[in-house]
């Protein structure tokens, strides 16, 4: 006769381990479902019910894995201003951020938006930096615009900003000195890629 | 689990160069979602952020503008550790110097969350 | 730089007591705030980050609100372990800076 498939939640035999993807839940004292990754356990197993598992809801990602599943799900990261996302959030992972390059920028609080390069303007009316768009006067930009019309970048809040830390070549790290005034352009260097 | 080991000498000459490691592990001093710094904290001017080191697909450094022209953090990924190099120092620079991990530079959710013991260091001659 | 100013500087308070602690930025930092716990000889603890959220094994009696530049750093129940210095952090514009700490004494 086949031996019995025993469903969770089940009473494991003494001496013996529950198997893969299943936890001993010590209040429950049995063999229950672990959540899948990225997953949290909503309702904890009893002697009668197994795990309820659910996933994280969107914008937010397991910060805490526990046997049984997630135990804590957690807003994604926020990149700022002058920063954008260098690997994106997961199921299991936080964003990353990082600082804009040289001729990129990033206007946004966000966990989404990548540094995008600023426009590229005939006439310069103001220099873009990281957490801002070149501003073009005159004639068109390379994003197409009336003629004419200067562009304003996006408003970004009144509050200032991190002060840009410029990239360098990654034999060495750059230098960046902070000024006690508000953010600055960063210096043009090479971008070390 | 992250630990921080911090060496280098608890006294130095004034006008000579204060040096100090942090040593990493559980963590790389590469990681692309850590960043590396220098705080130090002393009676009179409590704790004072100097500096960090970090790398996401190059290496980024930030410094303070009251140390800029005086200050180096350097990586060192032989050795999965960074340093602490300040120039011309005077007893001001007296101070317990620790190193600390930070999580979530230019996002949200950016905090130091682990930090070194700490290292009295005394500038007298 | 960003000055962060903490009030009191120092404050007695007894096991059991409630007790609050404010942190006033010199310009707006939205949440860009954390505050820590520090020991005598030993190195700053995290405690809550972006203003009001309780680090992975904080116990619950503390807690922190505020936005803008004004914050507060709250210890419900006071325990014994709970006496200590605390710091307020802003991060919201590079340098970093810190509060100059309130120190918790037993009364």
């Known amino acids: 006769l086949p031996a019995q498939v025993a469903f969770t939640p089940y009473a494991p035999e003494p001496g013996s381990t529950c198997r893969l993807r299943e936890y001993y839940d010590q209040t429950a004292q049995m063999c229950c479902s672990k959540c899948s990754p990225g997953q949290h356990a909503k309702v904890f197993c009893t002697k009668t019910s197994d795990t309820v598992c659910d996933t994280c809801r969107p914008g937010w990602y397991c910060a805490l894995s526990k046997q049984e599943g997630c135990r804590l799900c957690a807003p994604l990261r926020k990149c700022r201003p002058g920063f954008g996302v260098a690997r994106p959030g997961t199921e299991t992972s936080d964003v990353v951020c990082k600082p804009c390059a040289p001729g990129t920028f990033s206007n946004t609080t966000s966990s989404t938006d990548i540094c995008r390069p600023h426009q590229i303007c005939n006439v310069v009316a103001i220099p873009g930096n990281a957490s801002m768009d070149a501003v073009c006067t005159s004639t068109s930009p390379t994003r197409s615009m009336a003629p004419g019309a200067v562009h304003l970048p996006q408003p970004v809040s009144t509050r200032s900003q991190h002060t840009q830390p410029t990239p360098e070549p990654s034999t060495a790290p750059s230098t960046s000195f902070l000024l006690p005034m508000g953010p600055s352009p960063p210096a043009e260097g090479s971008t070390g890629d | 689990q992250v630990q921080l080991q911090q060496s280098g000498p608890g006294l130095v000459k004034p006008s000579q160069t204060l040096s100090l490691t942090c040593a990493i592990s559980?963590?790389?001093?590469?990681?692309?979602?850590?960043?590396w710094n220098w705080i130090r904290q002393s009676p009179s001017r409590g704790l004072e952020w100097l500096g960090r080191?970090?790398?996401?697909?190059?290496?980024?450094?930030d410094y303070t503008v009251s140390v800029k022209s005086r200050i180096t953090i350097n990586p060192d990924t032989s050795k999965n550790q960074f340093s602490l190099q300040l120039n011309s120092v005077t007893p001001e620079d007296t101070a317990v110097y620790y190193c600390a991990r930070e999580d979530g530079v230019g996002g949200t959710k950016d905090y130091f969350d682990y930090w070194g013991q700490g290292t009295l260091v005394t500038v007298s001659s | 730089d960003i000055q962060m100013t903490q009030s009191p500087s120092s404050l007695s308070a007894s096991v059991g007591d409630r007790v609050t602690i404010t942190c006033q930025a010199s310009?707006?930092?939205?949440?860009?705030l954390n505050w820590y716990q520090q020991k005598p000889g030993k190195a700053p603890k995290l405690l809550i980050y972006d203003a009001s959220n309780l680090e992975t094994g904080v116990p619950s009696r503390f807690s922190g609100s505020g936005s803008g530049t004004d914050f507060t750093f709250t210890i419900n129940s006071l325990q014994p372990e709970d006496f200590a210095t605390y710091f307020c952090?802003?991060?919201?514009?590079?340098?970093?800076?810190f509060g100059q700490g309130t120190r918790l004494e037993i009364k």
């Open positions: 952090q802003q991060y919201d514009n590079l340098p970093i800076t």
């Open positions: 559980g963590d790389s001093v590469s990681s692309d979602s850590s960043a």
């Open positions: 310009q707006d930092i939205s949440n860009y």
């Open positions: 080191t970090y790398y996401r697909s190059k290496w980024y450094n």
